[in-house]
């Protein structure tokens, strides 16, 4: 009876279990009743990082110097290239696909410490009573407007991203 499931590092095809190709190799042909799975090593600047049945290897990532990127770790047949940013610049994400001089703080966050040549911007969440409605690399959280000092009342509460809205007091006739 043909199998319905295969062991680890195997795959089911044409009612039989074939061996997966090891990392660094791609599939050329599936196994048969009489032959083993045929695999081939990935070419230069290619990789596969898992046991697989891929017919094409993945291209190594290109660390584009026009984006401020450079190679941190050269790729192998089993691993992708790892990019990092030029000295003094910061990756915009874990994947490091682009570089910024320093990060900015999103709305709801204020700048705790402005970036220097050796450290990135440090952001902090705006506490109750403060807000930031902009992305900035230098602006701190701003205090909510004090309606009372303007002889007004709060018409709309503030948040970490918005100021309070003040309005006239209801006058008793």
């Amino acid at each position: 009876e043909p199998p319905t499931a295969c062991r680890e590092k195997q795959y089911l095809i044409n009612s039989q279990c074939c061996s997966l190709c090891q990392p660094g190799q791609k599939l050329v042909s599936d196994c048969t009743e009489f032959t083993e799975t045929e695999c081939l090593p990935c070419g230069e600047s290619e990789f596969l990082d898992t046991w697989n049945r891929e017919t094409h290897c993945h291209q190594h990532k290109y660390c584009d110097p026009n984006l401020g990127l450079r190679v941190q770790q050269k790729g192998t047949s089993e691993t992708d290239t790892i990019c990092t940013c030029e000295e003094g610049w910061h990756c915009t994400s874990e994947a490091c696909e682009s570089c910024v001089l320093h990060r900015s703080c999103s709305p709801g966050f204020g700048v705790k410490q402005i970036a220097t040549g050796v450290s990135d911007t440090i952001c902090e969440p705006c506490p109750v009573g403060f807000f930031s409605n902009v992305s900035s690399a230098f602006e701190k959280c701003h205090p909510w407007t004090s309606c009372e000092t303007k002889d007004l009342v709060v018409q709309q509460a503030g948040t970490n991203k918005t100021d309070v809205v003040c309005g006239p007091q209801d006058r008793l006739r």
Epitope: L67, L101, R103, S135, S136, E139
Partner: nanobody, 116 residues
């Protein structure tokens, strides 16, 4: 495509003044916080000054406070840096930059040399 074109640099004696300009195109200038950043020969990038989109709030590094003034004209898509009481240590290439400071969005800079 974002373009930032700095101008106004040159050779000036200590104590002198210069006004740098940065002409911006390829983005909505009035929506962006803008910065002046400089790089002295053989040194890293130093954040000099910043201004919010409306031009109402500014930041200055301690090294230039009281001597430099940042401003912007949103109708002309231009950023300025007025530099007074220049010192030898202000010698650098000056760049303008927009949030979020992508590497590829930087201009060529303008060289300021303070020397007698």
């Amino acid at each position: 495509e974002v373009q930032l074109l700095e101008s106004g640099g040159g050779l000036v004696q200590p104590g002198g003044s210069l006004r740098l300009s940065c002409a911006a195109s390829g983005f909505t200038f009035r929506d962006y916080e803008m910065w002046w950043v400089r790089q002295a020969p053989g040194k890293g990038l130093e954040r000099v000054s910043a201004i919010n989109p409306q031009g109402t709030r500014t930041y200055y590094a301690d090294s230039v406070k009281g001597r430099f003034t940042i401003s912007r004209d949103n109708s002309k898509n231009t950023l300025y840096l007025q530099m007074n009481s220049l010192r030898a240590e202000d010698t650098a290439v000056y760049y303008c930059a927009k949030l979020p400071f992508f590497f590829e969005e930087w201009g060529q800079g303008t060289l300021v040399t303070v020397s007698s």
